[in-house]
């Protein structure tokens, strides 16, 4: 049997001992000083790093590696010579002392030595590859450094020229500003002169307006007697209609929905304990037809049914007769509740109408009519108003007596022209009259000198288009 053992002697030489039968063979191999063993801390993978080493450090390491390679090469040559010499000596000894069957042992030893040699060669190849790898990396790094240096130089040059250009531009602009300042002073002087002239004109116009207003007040007084007679008559008719509808509904038990509470208006919603602003479902009087409306449960005691809202121009108000009849838009935003519902509701009992207005300068105003109702569709949803109070003008901006409702496809105004087409939106136009809250929505700084805007003449004049409007109704006895 064979026993092959590898150990180190006291001097540090590698010692190979082979036991075969009664014979024992020992080989002593020289150990190179500069040649590190595989257990050395300088392992092969230490050369390959993800981040390249600093340049000087790399150069040093390269030199170390070159030395190691040279030493390894020398050591290999010595090893070959050593093996050959030993082999010759051993062969002679074996031939002299050993029997023929010792040949096998010698072959085994030779094989082991060759394996050792191959192992060393492989290690060298590894080191060589690593050196090449590192060299390539360093070359690339150097190339990158030089490229980035070039790039930085170019950028500096570009920036320098850019700075020069900007300096030129700056001085040019400075000159221009000075010239403009001179021009501006001249313009200001001419504007001041114009302003003085305009003030004279305005004062003249004010006196004319005052005279006209006096005439209008006189005309209004003359009209009020006729209006009172008409409204008293209408009130009597309304009372009769209410009495008739009450007796009819008493006979018709199907009107009341057992399973669901229904509300005629926001005042009923409020009285049922729902005192939060929001959208609620309302039921048409004497019908199961439903509509959703926004209820203002806070302003002036709450219970207000919003019948119109303008706030941002998001909804087109240039609509057909049918659309104004049934309503359009969204109760949470801009909308028109619908003439049919409002007509039916306001003919059931006495309602007040409040119109709330906002201008673009942060001012607010309102007009409150103590009695409001709309005629039926057959009478073109004519508006009826009585008893004006509020801060949006002493005179009603909805012409008195009330006019029929007009739309782009339903012209019922008192003008040869078609007011709805000309001023846009559906409204109770006269010829064409001092108001239109359903006109074109104009944004800030575009809202003046607009004949077709959102107009309330006796608050902001004829050409001013308002920022926001809300029309709301509530029972007079709320």
């Amino acid at each position: 049997y064979n026993n092959f053992r590898k150990s180190m002697d006291s001097i540090g030489k590698k010692q190979y001992q082979v036991q075969h039968g009664s014979c024992s063979y020992t080989f002593l191999l020289p150990e190179m000083d500069n040649c590190r063993s595989s257990s050395s801390p300088y392992v092969s993978n230490a050369v390959q790093r993800d981040a390249p080493l600093e340049y000087d450090d790399s150069v040093q390491r390269l030199q170390v590696l070159e030395n190691i390679m040279e030493n390894n090469t020398q050591w290999l040559m010595k090893l070959e010579n050593y093996i050959q010499d030993n082999m010759k000596k051993e062969m002679v000894e074996i031939q002299q002392n050993a029997v023929q069957n010792q040949t096998a042992v010698m072959i085994e030893i030779g094989t082991n030595l060759l394996n050792q040699t191959a192992e060393q060669t492989r290690k060298l190849t590894d080191v060589e590859a690593q050196v090449l790898n590192q060299t390539t990396r360093l070359e690339l790094q150097l190339l990158e450094h030089s490229l980035s240096t070039n790039k930085l130089e170019k950028q500096i040059l570009d920036q320098t020229s850019e700075i020069n250009k900007l300096q030129d531009k700056n001085s040019f602009l400075e000159k221009k500003v000075l010239a403009m300042e001179d021009k501006h002073i001249i313009q200001l002087q001419s504007i001041k002169e114009e302003k003085d002239q305009l003030q004279v004109l305005v004062s003249k116009q004010n006196s004319i307006i005052e005279e006209l207003e006096k005439k209008i007040v006189t005309a209004t007084v003359n009209n009020s007697v006729l209006q009172k007679q008409q409204h008293d008559l209408m009130e009597t008719v309304n009372n009769l209609l209410t009495m008739m509808s009450t007796s009819n509904s008493a006979k018709d038990p199907t009107v009341a929905k057992e399973e669901q509470i229904s509300f005629r208006d926001c005042a009923e919603v409020f009285k049922s304990g729902h005192t939060t602003n929001g959208i609620y479902t309302l039921t048409f009087p004497n019908s199961t037809e439903e509509i959703k409306a926004y209820c203002d449960m806070e302003a002036g005691g709450g219970g207000w049914t919003i019948i119109q809202r303008r706030e941002d121009g998001s909804v087109d108000f240039q609509r057909t007769w049918k659309e104004y009849k049934v309503g359009f838009g969204n109760p949470s935003g801009e909308y028109w509740l619908g003439n049919e519902f409002v007509s039916q509701l306001t003919n059931q009992q006495r309602y007040v109408l409040k119109i709330h207005l906002k201008d673009w300068e942060g001012n607010e105003a309102y007009s409150l009519y103590e009695h409001f109702y709309l005629s039926s569709e057959e009478l073109n949803y004519r508006i009826h108003l009585k008893g004006l109070t509020g801060t949006a003008g002493k005179i009603s901006s909805i012409s008195q007596p009330g006019n029929d409702f007009s739309t782009k496809d339903g012209d019922n105004d008192k003008c040869i022209c078609k007011c709805s087409q000309m001023l846009t939106g559906g409204w109770w136009f006269d010829a064409c009259g001092p108001s239109n809250l359903n006109g074109m929505y104009y944004p800030q700084r575009q809202n003046t000198n607009k004949f077709n805007g959102i107009k309330w003449y006796y608050w902001k004049g004829s050409g001013y288009s308002l920022k926001a409007t809300t029309m709301m109704i509530r029972p007079a006895d709320f």
């Epitope: 479902t281 199961t288 439903e290 509509i291 959703k292 049918k322 049934v326 838009g329 969204n330 949470s332």
Partner: antibody, heavy 119, light 107 residues
């Protein structure tokens, strides 16, 4: 753009419960009444429930009253339908829908979620 | 509740045909009727509301008419994409109720 996405459907045994959800986006959820509408396989559309903007008013047909509960969470832009005591005839695709504003015609619908009630 | 009865329940037609679907309400609903189109596996799509107002983006070949209790949806010239099921719905009062549907098939 307006989007309604239903979830929570699945297979459930008769007498069991299920909670459907509808995630809304692309509009101010708290400005609109919301609806559940269902469609049994091969059948027509049937309204199931309505909820008002604030959730104080809810409406149901007799077929689901007392078993189904509609609710909403305006902070989470979500609509829910809690379905209890489920029956085989409740098997349907359940759609969440939004109306136009003033009247209940349905402009926006979800893709639907299938509820199967079977033993 | 208001019942909505649609007729016919199904019909066969060819591309280019004029198709008429009717819907009858159990009580007067004024003009508060909407029409929807539904294709298999999809949610319904609004076509018409207030009996005759076309919803945004709906082709002009679709038209609606009627008031009171009798309503009609007309497709003037049937297109390949129009083969679907059509539903009427009243939006007059709660609960909103639908017709049973009309399936338009290829002849």
């Amino acid at each position: 753009q307006v989007q309604l996405v239903e979830s929570g459907g699945g297979l459930v045994k008769p007498g069991g419960s299920l909670r459907l959800s509808c995630a809304a986006s692309g509009f101010t959820f708290s400005d609109y009444y919301m609806y559940w509408i269902r469609q049994a396989p091969g059948k027509g559309l049937e309204w199931v429930s309505t909820i008002s903007v604030g959730g104080s008013f809810t409406y149901y047909p007799d077929s689901v009253k007392g078993r189904f509960t509609i609710s909403r969470d305006n902070a989470k832009n979500s609509l829910y339908l809690q379905m209890n005591s489920l029956r085989a005839e409740d098997t349907a695709v359940y759609y969440c829908a939004r109306d136009w504003g003033l009247r209940p015609w349905f402009v926006y619908w979800g893709q639907g979620t299938l509820v199967t009630v079977s033993s | 509740d208001i019942q909505m009865t649609q007729s016919p329940s199904s019909l066969s037609a060819s591309v280019g045909d004029r198709v008429t679907i009717t819907c009858k309400a159990s009580q007067d609903v004024s003009t508060a009727v909407a029409w929807y189109q539904q294709k298999p596996g999809k949610a319904p799509k609004l076509l018409i509301y207030w009996a005759s107002t076309r919803h945004t983006g709906v082709p002009s070949r679709f038209s609606g008419s009627g008031s009171g209790t009798d309503f009609t949806l007309t497709i003037s010239s049937l297109q390949p994409e129009d083969f679907a099921t059509y539903y009427c719905q009243q939006h007059y009062s709660t609960p909103p109720t639908f017709g049973q549907g009309t399936k338009v098939e290829i002849k």
